[in-house]
């Protein structure tokens, strides 16, 4: 049996953060958007991903992992420069491929120690190990040509499910819902919201039947559809309210009135 190196217990140092706000807890705020952000975790002394709701929250929130590290990890930039000459690969680059316990289908990349290259693999969507990257570029940076040893995260960072060959492009019926082909369809340039709100409903790749809502840019409304539990796209919300909040704001009804609230 293939046993993975343990990556669950780590020694905690007594490092002081650079700014007081780095010690704040991650705060997703009261709104319901799902924006991938990063925060500094005082307990693990690492920058970690969290989902930001889109409003309020606190200062311990960064758009990129790099920005979070630069702001909150003492000496991060210095060690990055110092290590650039001859950096070692993090231990997790040598872990064997682990698709994880679940069976969603996500396109990921891992470092193959045999070929000394980053390669694509299919990740199941939960657990697994840290030799698991969202992009080829990220894998190469960290494991093929490490510029600096990154602060390892506790678990795999999740990203959107792979939908290769499974994205619905143009159909008038989605999961038995007839999508009205209205003559008043807003043109794409009239929509200033999140791009995924323009995607068609996609029921995904698995076998469950979960009630979800998608935004129909033709009607300006959120409609119900059946989600199979994995795969699909970001036009997928657990409630109609959350769907409307996330997508309705981007529809420009009238140039003088501005954005619909």
């Amino acid at each position: 049996l293939s046993e993975e190196a343990d990556d669950t217990d780590s020694e905690l140092g007594s490092m002081k953060p650079l700014h007081t706000f780095c010690a704040m807890k991650a705060d997703d705020g009261p709104c319901k958007a799902m924006i991938r952000s990063y925060f500094f975790n005082m307990y693990t002394h690492q920058c970690e991903e969290f989902i930001y709701g889109g409003c309020e929250g606190n200062e311990n929130r960064f758009d990129t992992l790099e920005e979070c590290k630069k702001t909150c990890i003492p000496g991060y930039e210095k060690t990055a420069v110092k290590a650039a000459s001859g950096a070692e690969r993090p231990d997790f680059c040598f872990l064997e491929e682990d698709p994880g316990l679940c069976r969603g289908y996500m396109k990921r990349y891992l470092y193959n120690n045999q070929t000394k290259q980053c390669e694509r693999f299919v990740y199941g969507g939960c657990l697994g190990n840290r030799n698991n990257f969202e992009t080829l570029d990220e894998c190469k940076k960290i494991c093929e040509n490490p510029v600096h040893s990154p602060s390892p995260v506790n678990e795999v960072q999740m990203s959107d499910y792979v939908t290769d060959g499974n994205t619905v492009t143009d159909r008038s019926t989605v999961n038995n819902i007839v999508v009205p082909q209205s003559p008043k369809v807003p043109r794409r340039r009239d929509y200033r919201g999140r791009p995924w709100c323009l995607q068609p409903a996609d029921s995904g790749l698995c076998k469950a039947s979960e009630r979800r809502f998608y935004y129909n840019s033709a009607t300006g409304k959120c409609h119900r559809f059946n989600y199979t539990g994995c795969g699909g796209n970001n036009n997928n919300f657990t409630t109609r309210r959350r769907c409307l909040r996330s997508c309705k704001t981007g529809l420009i009804k009238n140039k003088s009135k501005g954005v619909v609230k």
């Epitope: 049996l1 293939s2 046993e3 993975e4 990556d7 669950t8 991650a26 997703d28 799902m34 969290f50 989902i51 491929e97 682990d98 698709p99 316990l101 679940c102 069976r103 199941g124 969507g125 939960c126 657990l127 506790n154 678990e155 999740m158 990203s159 959107d160 499910y161 698995c206 076998k207 469950a208 979960e210 979800r212 989600y227 539990g229 699909g232 970001n234 997928n236 919300f237 657990t238 959350r242």
Partner: antibody
Framework: QVQLQQSGPGLVKPSQTLSLTCAIS??????????WSWIRQSPGRGLEWLGI?????????RYAVSVKSRITINPDTSKNQFSLQLNSVTPEDTAVYYC?????????????WGQGTLVTVSS | DIVMTQSPLSLPVTPGEPASISCRSS???????????LNWYLQKPGQSPQLLIY???NRASGVPDRFSGSGSGTDFTLKISRVEAEDVGVYYC?????????FGQGTKVEIK
């Protein structure tokens, strides 16, 4: 309908090895849409996950750090079962032991459980 | 390890009345599209646990619709709209965001 049938001794002496088996019917231990786990329950510690095995392109396992140095979970494909071995037991290992199936396709959860085996560690 | 904390630990209920159990995790369990890596189980007296709710809010096969799961991130709730006598037992939440898989300490639901 998946059924998990546990077997093994209810009494084990301290320092010896606890061995339990879980026979599967209605599914295969080699299924790529399942994973197979051992979980124990004691009054002091509640439900405690011990480890899991699963077959994808090959076999994988993961163990809880608390028992990692003492535990082995193995599949037996010929008998369609899997086993738990816990070495060097102490009275602290006294608990009800459950085998369980993790549904990897639909539920993403432990959707079938064995009947439980009370194991007492005592001399 | 992700610590799962349930409250209350004991919940006396009246048949026909609603009941609510809270589960809080020490780290966010949210994934994409509002999926939360959290399950709920019920262990009836003298039985093995059974899966009630998966991915935070989806009822497992054969689970009555009086059971519902909600919440996101670190705060989750299991609600029983109208408690029936057969609902007594210990309810557990469980996370699968990271190893080790961890359970809450349980909430014992009993009839008043």
């Amino acid at each position: 309908q998946v059924q998990l049938q546990q077997s093994g001794p209810g009494l084990v002496k301290p320092s010896q090895t606890l061995s339990l088996t879980c026979a599967i019917s209605g599914d295969s231990v080699s299924s790529d849409s399942a994973a197979w786990s051992w979980i124990r329950q004691s009054p002091g510690r509640g439900l405690e996950w011990l480890g899991i095995i699963y077959k994808r392109s090959k076999w994988y396992n993961r163990y809880a750090v608390s028992v990692k140095s003492r535990i082995t979970i193995n599949p037996d494909t010929s008998k369609n079962q899997f086993s738990l071995q816990l070495n060097s037991v102490t009275p602290e290992d006294t608990a009800v032991y459950y085998c369980a199936r993790w549904h990897s396709d639909k539920h993403w959860g432990f959707d079938d459980w064995g009947q439980g085996t009370l194991v007492t560690v005592s001399s | 390890d992700i610590v799962m904390t349930q409250s209350p630990l004991s919940l006396p209920v009246t048949p026909g009345e609603p009941a609510s159990i809270s589960c809080r995790s020490s780290q966010s369990l949210v994934f994409r599209f509002g999926i939360n890596y959290l399950n709920w189980y019920l262990q009836k007296p003298g039985q093995s646990p059974q899966l009630l709710i998966y991915k935070g809010s989806n009822r497992a096969s054969g689970v009555p619709d009086r059971f519902s799961g909600s919440g996101s991130g670190t705060d989750f709730t299991l609600k029983i709209s109208r408690v029936e006598a057969e609902d007594v037992g210990v309810y557990y939440c469980q996370q699968y965001t990271s190893y080790p898989l961890t359970f809450g300490q349980g909430t014992k639901v009993e009839i008043k």
